[in-house]
């Protein structure tokens, strides 16, 4: 059996922050998981960890040097991005494992997330030119 | 039997345009077959066509808006995109059709290249103010 | 068929280490948690470590805590243990167990004996 | 840690008797609770998961019951094949802990 993910299509983060709500076709009240958002069709970089279980406050981070924070619903996570850059648009993938109580229990493939980060193109002021940052 | 295909997993359009490539575990040489490019995780848009047979000169369209190219090899189809938009910053799939000689082939699917469009970002001169275009 | 095969046990001195691997067949081992259950001669059964399907939590006895780590390579369908500092009361039959619902399916073990 | 408890930690019996085996978990665990069988030089082999459901291949004279801290196996009636080594264990919660296992031997 696996949980099945349901996730937009595509969101653009126009100030270089995005809100990723990875829904389950499961219930994670009172279970010790590990939600976990992964940048790249081979979802090779692991951007957001949320873990929690049943005795302690929920744990989110990133070894990867991402800005991420993650609010928990019932059958949901959603991970909270800042500071993107540009160039980390990309898919980003929601996995889930479930491992206690069993079964031991993880998630069908999602379609994936393109986060589209427009981020914020600044221009020289009138008064004094200088280069433009891309 | 399908056709394996190789795409690029990330591409950047930094001036609207781009060059992807589509590599098939299969030998197009006087073939007919209908090579295509779709856009988005449920590749609901055909970006655009290459069909080629032996008898008649390579056939490039688009029907949704696109304009592109097409180039042929032995065991490829690269479709050349310009005049991109930010916001057709997406995922792609490369799709082949081969329809004589039989068997008729087609592909499994590809993981797809994110085409991120990076466009111009366009200043205005400090003699002449007037709003930046995002 | 599920088949789960270990190696790597063998005699080591007190304080050396060894790497025990479990292959596994018959099953798509990146969608399973996997365990390692040892059993000192004679004893009962005492679990030992536990991985996720992706390798991305791991549980351990608080009895080899710091000293053993459990890790996977999806890719070679293979899991393994890594113990280090090993003492005398490590000696054991070492069995890598696929866990779903239960410890479902078990390899045959390995012998580990800690001696000098 | 939940320590589970096994009870008796030996018992010699006739082919054909009625077999039970109890376990005691420390704190509850719902239903999170399975069996194994356990024969000299062999690996252990799952026989109850979830308290009270038969694996797979797994004659139906062994049987499972219970929830929370109190579990039960029972041997309807005991085989020949049956003499052998019985744990519990639980997975509701980590770590995942064993009986100290029930010895069924020969009368």
């Known amino acids: 059996n696996k949980i099945l993910v349901k996730q937009s299509p595509m969101l653009v983060a126009y100030d270089n922050a995005v809100n990723l709500s990875c829904k389950y076709s499961y219930n994670l009240f009172s279970r010790e998981f590990r939600a976990s958002l992964h940048k790249g069709l081979d979802s090779a970089v692991e951007v957001c960890v949320v873990y929690g279980n049943y005795s302690q406050q929920l744990q989110v981070y990133s070894k990867t040097g991402f800005n991420c924070d993650g609010k928990l619903g019932n059958e949901s996570v959603t991970f909270y991005l800042q500071n993107l850059y540009v160039n980390q648009t990309d898919i980003y993938f929601c996995k889930i494992e479930v491992m206690y109580p069993p079964p031991y229990l993880d998630n069908e493939k999602s379609n994936g997330t393109i986060i589209h980060v427009k981020g914020k193109h600044l221009c020289p002021s009138p008064l004094f030119p200088g280069p433009s940052k891309p | 039997n399908k056709i394996l295909v190789k795409q690029s997993p990330m591409l950047v359009a930094y001036d609207n345009a781009v060059n992807l490539s589509c590599k098939y575990s299969y030998n197009l040489f006087s073939r007919e077959f209908r090579a295509s490019l779709h856009k988005g995780l449920d590749s609901a848009v055909e970006v655009c066509v290459v069909y080629g047979n032996y008898s008649q000169q390579l056939q490039v369209y688009s029907k949704t808006g696109f304009n592109c190219d097409g180039k042929l090899g032995n065991e490829s189809v690269t479709f050349y995109l310009q005049n991109l938009y930010v916001n057709q910053t997406d995922i792609y799939f490369c799709k082949i059709e081969v329809m004589y000689p039989p068997p008729y082939l087609d592909n499994e699917k590809s993981n797809g290249t994110i085409i991120h469009v990076k466009g111009k970002h366009l200043c205005p001169s400090p003699l002449f103010p007037g709003p930046s275009k995002p | 068929e599920v088949q789960l095969l270990e190696s790597g046990g063998g005699l080591v001195q007190p304080g050396g280490s060894l790497r025990l691997s479990c292959a596994a067949s018959?099953?798509?081992?990146?969608?399973?948690?996997m365990s390692w259950v040892r059993q000192a001669p004679g004893k009962g059964l005492e679990w030992v470590s536990a991985?996720?399907?992706?390798?991305?939590?791991?549980y351990y006895a608080d009895s080899v805590k710091g000293r053993f780590t459990i890790s996977r390579d999806n890719s070679k369908n293979t899991l393994y243990l890594q113990m280090n500092s090993l003492r005398a009361e490590d000696t054991a039959v070492y069995y890598c167990a696929k866990r779903y619902i239960a410890f479902d399916y078990w390899g045959q073990g390995t012998l580990v004996t800690v001696s000098s | 840690d939940i320590q589970m408890t096994q009870s008796p930690s030996s018992l010699s019996a006739s082919v054909g008797d009625r077999v039970t085996i109890t376990c005691r978990a420390s704190q509850s665990i719902s239903s999170y609770l399975n069996w194994y069988q356990q024969k000299p030089g062999k690996a252990p082999k799952l026989l109850i998961y979830a308290a009270s459901s038969l694996q797979s291949g797994v004659p139906s004279r062994f049987s499972g019951s219970g929830s929370g801290t109190d579990f039960t196996l029972t041997i309807s009636s005991l085989q020949p094949e049956d003499f052998a080594t019985y744990y519990c264990?639980?997975?509701?919660?980590?770590?995942?802990?064993f009986g100290q296992g029930t010895k069924v031997e020969i009368k």
């Open positions: 991985i996720s399907g992706s390798g991305g939590s791991t």
């Open positions: 264990q639980q997975g509701g919660m980590p770590p995942d802990t």
């Open positions: 018959g099953f798509t081992f990146s969608s399973y948690a």
